[in-house]
């Protein structure tokens, strides 16, 4: 417990020690178990890392991630005529980001108010489930997209409808897998009341007995199955893609595609280096240290890594930009505060004026004119 007079704290992690056992009152109402934390944990829960730094990063992620992924999903669903596998994977990627990001205002409020969760047990579980679900969904859909990009280069011709159906099937399988692997996060009690701090934490404090064994095994399994294996596939796809692009003949169009492919590879690499690798590595190291030593010296790094993992919702739109022509057009026009239709109308108008002042045969709804800046 966070004794000021006894500085030999139990553990440099957010381990909750049971203060009172759950019991049934005379009215038959079960009273929840209450926890105390060690002084390092208490200092983290009341410190600037969790109450200032985290909300700032989450606010940035929300402000950037919500509109960009919202627009991406809209473009992929309603503004992209041909639903190629890449479009299907990106639409799922955008959906995963949106499902995580929409809960961020609650997460921001939670941290700003001193890590005090006032929204109930169910919402906490949803937030945590979606938080981790998004990370693993992103890894898997990014892997699918990477493999698919390589496959397009190797095998440019193929039955589009069949490919799209396969992509939809794979996407549904991924959602089902993520739902299954995140079940423990929905089942485990995530909210803990800490009387000493007068706060109810969400996921930040977990029962010691649960932390020690189960959490290490759980996150180790996820790190191997849903991070390392997909990461290996992604890396392989990009290595092979680079080889293919190097050996292929270079005309102006191919050079453009090559540059865009390199930008995509750099973006995905950045995502792995910033978002996925640190968080998965530190999740395992953090819980291993608790399991083996009873304390985690990397707690602050673990907090930062998990926080940075949410930046994938801001980086994903760059992936869409380098892969999807439609998203590229809409993103450019959104940034220039004008619609694609307006741009097309302007271009059509200019073209018509050039050919004949009397001509009125061009339509504003023309979809053949491509935007170029």
């Amino acid at each position: 417990t966070i004794q000021g007079t006894n500085r030999s704290s139990k553990g440099r992690s957010l381990i909750g020690k049971v203060d009172g056992t759950s019991h049934v009152t005379g009215k038959g109402v079960t009273v929840e178990t209450v926890f105390s934390v060690d002084e390092f944990s208490a200092s983290v829960l009341t410190g600037k890392l969790t109450t200032v730094f985290l909300p700032i990063v989450y606010t940035i992620v929300f402000v950037v991630g919500l509109p960009s992924n919202g627009m991406a999903l809209w473009v992929f669903l309603f503004r992209t005529k041909k639903k190629h596998p890449a479009v299907i994977y990106m639409a799922n990627l955008a959906l995963a980001d949106l499902l995580s990001v929409i809960w961020f205002p609650l997460k921001i409020a939670y941290h700003i108010h001193g890590n005090n969760w006032i929204y109930g047990e169910a919402l906490c579980n949803v937030l945590i489930g979606f938080f981790y679900g998004n990370m693993y969904c992103s890894i898997l859909f990014m892997t699918c997209l990477s493999v698919q990009r390589y496959w397009v280069i190797v095998n440019p011709m193929g039955h589009s409808r069949k490919k799209a159906n396969i992509a939809i099937g794979i996407s549904l399988a991924i959602w089902l897998l993520i739902l299954l692997v995140t079940i423990p996060l929905y089942v485990v009690k995530q909210t803990i009341f800490i009387p000493a701090l007068n706060i109810t934490t969400c996921h930040d404090v977990l029962p010691e007995q649960l932390l020690v064994g189960d959490m290490f095994n759980y996150f180790l399994s996820l790190a191997i199955g849903v991070f390392l294996f997909p990461a290996f596939l992604t890396a392989s796809a990009y290595v092979l893609m680079i080889r293919m692009l190097r050996s292929s003949a270079m005309d102006e169009n191919s050079e453009k595609k090559r540059k865009r492919a390199i930008k995509l590879i750099v973006t995905v690499l950045a995502m792995y280096l910033i978002c996925f690798t640190p968080s998965n590595l530190l999740l395992v190291v953090h819980y291993f240290l608790i399991k083996s030593q009873g304390q985690s010296h990397v707690y602050a790094l673990y907090i930062v890594a998990l926080c940075l993992s949410t930046l994938n919702s801001c980086i994903d739109p760059f992936v869409y930009y380098f892969v999807s022509h439609d998203f590229r057009d809409h993103a450019k026009n959104a940034l220039l505060c004008r619609s694609v239709r307006t741009v097309k109308q302007m271009q059509v108008s200019l073209t018509s004026k050039k050919h004949s002042r009397k001509s009125s045969s061009y339509s504003s709804s023309s979809t053949t004119v491509k935007t170029s800046y």
């Epitope: 417990t1 966070i2 004794q3 000021g4 007079t5 500085r7 203060d19 009172g20 019991h23 009152t25 009273v31 178990t33 209450v34 002084e39 208490a42 200092s43 829960l45 009341t46 109450t51 001193g114 800490i194 009387p195 000493a196 701090l197 007068n198």
Partner: antibody, heavy 121, light 107 residues
Framework: EVQLVESGGGLVQPGRSLKLSCVAS????????MSWIRQAPGKGLEWVAS????????FYPDSVKGRFTISRDNAQNTLYLQMNSLRSEDAATYYC??????????????WGQGTLVTVSS | DIQMTQSPHSLSASLGETVSIECLAS??????LAWYQQKPGKSPQLLIY???SLKDGVPSRISGSGSGTQYSLKISNMQPEDEGVYYC?????????FGGGTKLELK
């Protein structure tokens, strides 16, 4: 050795204001939550206010909410209690307290000697 | 708010006797209970916290027990320095609340 020394008490008319101070020594002041507790003459103890180590969160009972303000100056190792719109029932000995807990508060381990506030016309 | 009810209001004991003071909370407080002793003209002193943990320097004759809503303070082998008013306090939820006090006198 932990020492808490209160000052600022005295006779005040109902409706008027008074500011109590508590100078702390013998410990790292900015690591601890601080509280004020009062005791009316011949009566029991009543918790009045608590403040976190950073001053970021503050707690009051309904009886003083909106009238009393707890604050702290970590650079000066001083805790304050600004009392406005004083009533006769606020007359008591006010104690400055510190918890045994580091970055938290459940009970009140260290107490000052108290400062007497008398509210009378 | 959590109400804390102490009993008895006062009691007297002879030297060497064992006495008990009860404290009842209006709802379960998960062992978040402290006991204080206050001598006339002095500030209260913390004796016990977490219902049964003895503060450093407090004689082992004094002990605390209980769970849920019911807690008690036991003083074995009554001594002159044990005279005073005893208060219980819950540290579970805000507002922090105290019992009304129990006055212990030496017969």
């Amino acid at each position: 050795e932990v020492q808490l020394v209160e000052s600022g008490g005295g006779l005040v008319q109902p409706g008027r204001s008074l500011k109590l101070s508590c100078v702390a020594s013998g410990f790292t002041f900015n690591n601890y939550w601080m509280s004020w507790i009062r005791q009316a003459p011949g009566k029991g103890l009543e918790w009045v206010a608590s403040i976190t180590n950073t001053g970021g969160r503050i707690f009051y009972p309904d009886s003083v909410k909106g009238r009393f303000t707890i604050s702290r100056d970590n650079a000066q190792n001083t805790l304050y209690l600004q009392m406005n719109s004083l009533r006769s029932e606020d007359a008591a000995t006010y104690y400055c307290t510190r918890d045994r807990l580091y970055y938290g508060s459940n009970w009140f381990t260290y107490w000052g000697q108290g400062t007497l506030v008398t509210v009378s016309s | 708010d959590i109400q804390m009810t102490q009993s008895p209001h006062s009691l007297s004991a002879s030297l060497g006797e064992t006495v008990s003071i009860e404290c009842l909370a209006s709802e379960a407080i998960s062992n978040y209970l402290a006991w204080y002793q206050q001598k006339p003209g002095k500030s209260p002193q913390l004796l016990i916290y977490y219902a049964s943990s003895l503060k450093d320097g407090v004689p082992s004759r004094i002990s605390g027990s209980g769970s849920g809503t019911q807690y008690s303070l036991k003083i074995s082998n009554m001594q002159p320095e044990d005279e005073g008013v005893y208060y219980c306090q819950q540290g579970y939820k805000y507002p922090r609340t105290f019992g009304g006090g129990t006055k212990l006198e030496l017969k």
